[in-house]
């Protein structure tokens, strides 16, 4: 889609005559008809396939045409088209004399034509005007023309539609060739993707507008490269989201157990020395003259044995003085560098000295972790057991106790209880969610049809003449034990009276 623009500049008709040579009376009141059509080697009459336009009367005989001429006309003349510009054209410009005010073709005599020019050729889309001058015997017309694309159309033939936008669907302007040019801060095929703050972490961060860096759950900071500790964490940090790695002096799953009670709570009174002795526990070493769990009670001088670590106490007028053995110092010989001697490892952890005894490291037994072996390892937290299996911590490992009908390390396999033919004596096995069930044949009972049930063949009293009835368990039939004087399978015949 585009516009062929024709700028009329000057028309010269010095003698004021028509094409027939006849003069106009009083002068040639001139207007123009323009016909734009497809390229023809020889321009012939016919439909103006690319469009046509007429001007009002622009002047008399010879005149210059001003831009955007008054009198309702427009200069340049606009011939819009809504197809791909083919690059070639034919143009017919006719100058007509208007004796009256009606400029319609049917209202004019055929001999009102002043001049007619026809050109054809190639024309590329562009902003530059092509200047042309056509001269006949009596007239001269100077004009220029060009083809430009309509708003939002671009490219060599005005076929590329591009409408600049700055909304949810894109943030761009259009280049001369119709390609998109993203506004600053946007990228992607349609400039819908914001360019995040420089340095914003590729995985942990994202943005909804340029120069922003929003963090995905579990991450924080300007560039989303710092993790967030677990919700319940109290005195810990993280190296991956939702962790809780305890600060020095804290233990437990959420680092809420005080391993350094002395520093955090200062429980020892009267200048006593505090020693941590496990989670939330401590020992106060009292200064001379004090006693009690927190050294809150006063004693006299050396009675309280104030000197620690083998130090000997000497009474003095203003108190006492401790003589410390080698390796210890301080008012009560209480100071030594924290080392394995202080038994810092809990839960049976073994202590290894480091830096020539200046520090230590704990080697934890299975099931315990942490810098002081203070945390119990729970290997069941990830719920590894499938199908309702129960997870059990077993020393350094874990095991799953499976529900009936399931097996495998993680209870992941379903076992058919009937697979091993558990029903005895031809019983039929049924695999149920709660276990198996056997349907037993006659004469058998029990969970697995393992119990033989005697069929009472004597129930129908088959024996006559007060004979005793017994059930034969091998055949489930009755046997009659006849009294004296009777015979027969049912003792139905008296002796001496055989069946007739």
């Amino acid at each position: 889609s585009g516009v062929f623009q024709l700028q009329l500049q000057e028309f010269v008709n010095e003698r004021g005559v028509l094409a027939s040579g006849r003069p106009c009376e009083p002068g040639c009141r001139t207007f123009f008809r323009v016909c734009l059509k497809h390229f023809q080697a020889v321009v012939s009459p016919g439909p103006c396939t690319f469009g046509s336009v007429s001007t009002p009367v622009l002047g008399t005989n010879s005149f210059a045409v001003r831009d955007d001429s008054s009198g309702g006309g427009r200069n340049p003349l606009q011939l819009p088209f809504n197809f791909t510009w083919p690059g070639t054209f034919s143009l017919i410009i006719e100058a007509w004399h208007a004796p009256g005010d009606d400029l319609r073709p049917e209202a004019l005599p055929p001999d009102a034509l002043i001049s007619k020019i026809a050109i054809q050729g190639s024309l590329a889309v562009g902003q530059n005007w092509l200047l042309d001058e056509q001269t006949s015997t009596l007239t001269r017309l100077r004009y220029s023309y060009r083809v430009i694309c309509s708003d939002n159309y671009y490219g060599d033939n005005c076929s590329r539609l591009c409408k600049k936008r700055n909304d949810h669907f894109g943030h761009y302007v259009c280049q001369p060739d119709g390609n998109l040019s993203c506004l600053p801060g946007w990228t992607g095929e349609y400039c819908q993707q914001p360019i995040c703050l420089s340095g914003c972490h590729e995985q942990n961060g994202y943005c909804s507008k340029p120069a922003e860096c929003l963090c995905r759950p579990g991450w924080q900071g300007r560039l989303c490269n710092e993790c967030i500790p677990h919700n319940g964490c109290r005195h810990g940090t993280c190296s991956t989201p939702w962790q809780c790695t305890c600060d020095e002096g804290w233990g437990g799953l959420f680092c809420d157990q005080d391993l350094n009670y002395c520093t955090h709570h200062s429980p020892c009174k009267n200048g006593a020395t505090c020693s941590n002795s496990g989670q939330r526990s401590y020992t106060c070493t009292c200064r001379p003259g004090y006693t009690g769990v927190d050294c809150e009670l006063e004693l006299s001088e050396c009675d309280s044995n104030p000197c620690r670590n083998g130090g000997s106490c000497k009474d003095q007028e203003d108190g006492y003085h401790c003589l410390c053995p080698p390796g210890y110092y301080g008012l009560h010989c209480e100071h030594s560098t924290l080392s394995c001697a202080d038994s810092p490892c809990f839960n049976g952890g073994s202590c290894r000295e480091r830096n020539q005894g200046a520090s230590y490291a704990c080697e934890c037994p299975p099931n315990f972790t942490g810098s002081n072996c203070e945390k119990k390892v729970d290997r069941c937290t990830s719920n590894p057991c499938a199908n309702g299996g129960q997870c059990l911590n077993r020393g350094p490992s874990r095991m799953c106790r499976c529900r009936p009908g399931f097996t495998g390390t993680y209870c992941e396999r379903h076992v058919s209880d009937c697979a091993r033919n558990p029903c005895a004596h031809g019983g039929t096995c049924h695999d149920l969610e709660s276990g198996l069930m056997c349907t037993c044949p006659a004469g058998f009972s029990g969970r697995r049809c393992e119990v033989r049930t005697s069929i009472d063949a004597c129930a129908s009293s088959p024996c006559f003449n007060r004979a005793t009835c017994y059930t034969d368990l091998s055949t489930d039939t009755f046997v009659c034990n006849c009294p004296y004087g009777f015979v027969g399978s049912r003792c139905e015949f008296p002796v001496g009276l055989p069946p007739s």
Epitope: S208, L214, C215, E226, I228, P229, H235, D247
Partner: antibody, heavy 118, light 107 residues
Framework: EVQLVESGGGLVQPGGSLRLSCAAS????????MAWVRQAPGKGLEWVAT????????TYRDSVKGRFTISRDNAKSSLYLQMNSLRAEDTAVYYC???????????WGQGTLVTVSS | DIQMTQSPSSLSASVGDRVTITCRAS??????LAWYQQKPGKAPKLLIY???NLADGVPSRFSGSGSGTDFTLTISSLQPEDFATYYC?????????FGQGTKLEIK
Amino acid sequence: EVQLVESGGGLVQPGGSLRLSCAASGFTFRNFPMAWVRQAPGKGLEWVATISSSDGWPTYRDSVKGRFTISRDNAKSSLYLQMNSLRAEDTAVYYCSRGYYNSPFAYWGQGTLVTVSS
Amino acid sequence: DIQMTQSPSSLSASVGDRVTITCRASEDIYSNLAWYQQKPGKAPKLLIYDTNNLADGVPSRFSGSGSGTDFTLTISSLQPEDFATYYCQQYNNYPPTFGQGTKLEIK
């Protein structure tokens, strides 16, 4: 025990300023991101601002950007909210909370009431 | 912003009842959802995070479920101290947003 105690609320005229404070204890303050969440009278909860623990980077809801400033002092275990150009619609109980805009708000203070009215 | 819609907005129940509150997100928030309990004049308290994880010290009668856009808070057997307003909150997308609340009252 984790404790968050807000202060600084009160009555202020539209266009006025107020500075809220929050004193934290019971956890290592410097390790955790913090937030302000508000609740207008009789209404629901609305996140206001967050500050990271690592670099003190602030984030705000659109309606308070340019007017409110969140800050922290790790040495004092304190969180602050400087509120300027206050509007009637900022009237609410302001809660100090431990959390970030992309995590749950695990612990909350008792709240401090800010009333913006002429 | 993601809209969080709770239902019902209010609910009457008796001690011992099983109660369910639902929360719907306007788009997928995966499992990044928390539930809070608030009593009149008090601060909210975190009950459940990551859809189904119980916060420290929360009784086991509270449970959460769901994923994507539909979530549920269940109280298996109501206790007198459970009568309060409950809020859901998503923290998957910026900014974090809360539901409008569900007021649980004694019948």
